[in-house]
Interface confidence: low
């Protein structure tokens, strides 16, 4: 026998209370597949967060994060803040990269300069807190 | 720019069925619902039913047995039929967008039905 | 089926008044209330979705208010173009039913 709850579209849930209509998700929930007994509540994107897509019917909605900060994490789990190119966020704050180290984004840990004698290079451009080295003909 | 517009018979004689199509731009069936609305000369706006973007359907209870509404997304077009129409059946047929499912934020312009022999 | 009451079939008033147009549910419905304005040559435009949340584009004079089974919109500052006939609609249960209707004229 077919369950009657399998007709529910995405964005109505089977309302048991009400002879298994398909009912309309209430403002502020969703439902993203077909058969569902209930909707869900929709993510708000508050504080550090903010909205980039809105929430429908049928999707939840989707948070970035305010200028300064940086998403991680599926679904942008957390904001995290921002640091200048050339820095590393720890957990004191942002910090200078240290000599031999770069970071040439708003995110992420410095990273060692390319060590062009390994490949028998010379330096062409030396590296920066900011960029990379760059290197020359052997 | 979001747009519906009805297309119906006109004059429909009592006892036989009525064939309205609403045919949609701007936007896509798959991802909005479509409601049909009606108003007699002179009255308010009645619910009739609605077609969810994946083709589910309710309808108001009063008509159930005398409705069905289905849709060709590829076409975008949604079909209202009603059968054994009597002269209370008289009325301008809107068809309209679910927004979200639970409101109708854009309307056709309707099209008028006028039931008699 | 719920009935949905708006009591005053027709007002009547002038360009610049505070305008309140009642609608009121035979059982609670959560707040789950559309407000819709149907002008004279049949168009039909929504107002105020979720008793009153203002819908793109509809000024701001409108406004929509209630809770339980009482609700109402609000036209603040009244201008010609808002001579129309108003319907509330709840979507709490099917059937979605509309109330009969609010005729605003200008005086």
């Known amino acids: 026998l077919q369950d009657p709850c399998s007709n529910c579209p995405a964005g109505t849930f089977c309302d048991n209370n009400r002879n298994q209509i398909c009912s309309p998700c209430p403002p502020n929930s969703f439902s993203s597949a077909g058969g569902q007994r209930t909707c869900d509540i929709c993510r708000q994107c508050k504080g550090v967060f903010r909205t980039r897509k809105e929430c429908s019917s049928t999707s939840n909605a989707e948070c970035d994060c305010t200028p300064g900060f940086h998403c991680l994490g599926a679904g942008c789990s957390m904001c995290e803040q921002d640091c200048k190119q050339g820095q590393e966020l720890t957990k004191q704050g942002c910090k200078d990269c240290r000599f031999g180290t770069f970071n040439d984004q708003k995110r992420g840990i410095c990273q060692p300069w390319t060590n062009c004698s390994l490949d028998g290079k010379s330096v062409l451009v030396n590296g920066t807190k900011e960029s990379d080295a760059v290197c020359g003909p052997s | 720019q979001v747009q519906l517009k009805e297309s119906g018979p006109g004059l429909v004689a009592p006892s036989q069925s009525l064939s309205i199509t609403c045919t949609v731009s701007?936007?896509?069936?798959?991802?909005?619902?479509i409601s049909w609305v009606r108003q007699p000369p002179g009255k308010g706006l009645e619910w009739l039913g609605i077609?969810?973007?994946?083709?589910?359907?309710n309808y108001n209870s009063a008509l159930k047995s005398r409705l069905s509404i289905s849709k060709d997304n590829s076409r975008s077009q949604v079909f209202l039929k009603m059968n054994s129409l009597q002269t209370d059946d008289t009325a301008r047929y809107y068809c309209?967008?679910?927004?979200?499912?639970?409101?109708?934020?854009?309307w056709g312009a309707g099209t008028t039905v006028t039931v008699s022999s | 089926d719920i009935q949905m009451t708006q009591s005053t079939s027709s007002l009547s008033a002038s360009v610049g008044d505070r305008v309140t147009i009642s609608c009121s549910a035979s059982?609670?419905?959560?707040?789950?209330l559309n407000w819709y304005q149907q002008k004279p040559d049949g168009t039909v435009k929504l107002l105020i979705y979720?008793?009153?949340s203002l819908h793109s584009g509809v000024p701001s004079r409108f406004s929509g208010s209630g809770s339980g089974t009482d609700y109402s919109l609000t036209i603040s500052n009244l201008e010609p173009e808002d001579i129309a006939t108003y319907y509330c609609?709840?979507?709490?249960?099917?059937?979605?039913?509309f109330g009969g209707g609010t005729k605003l004229e200008i005086k």
């Open positions: 309209a967008r679910g927004a979200g499912t639970w409101y109708f934020d854009v």
């Open positions: 979720y008793t009153s």
């Open positions: 701007g936007f896509s069936l798959t991802t909005y619902a």
């Open positions: 609609q709840q979507y709490s249960k099917f059937p979605w039913t």
């Open positions: 077609i969810w973007p994946g083709g589910g359907t």
């Open positions: 059982q609670g419905i959560s707040n789950y």
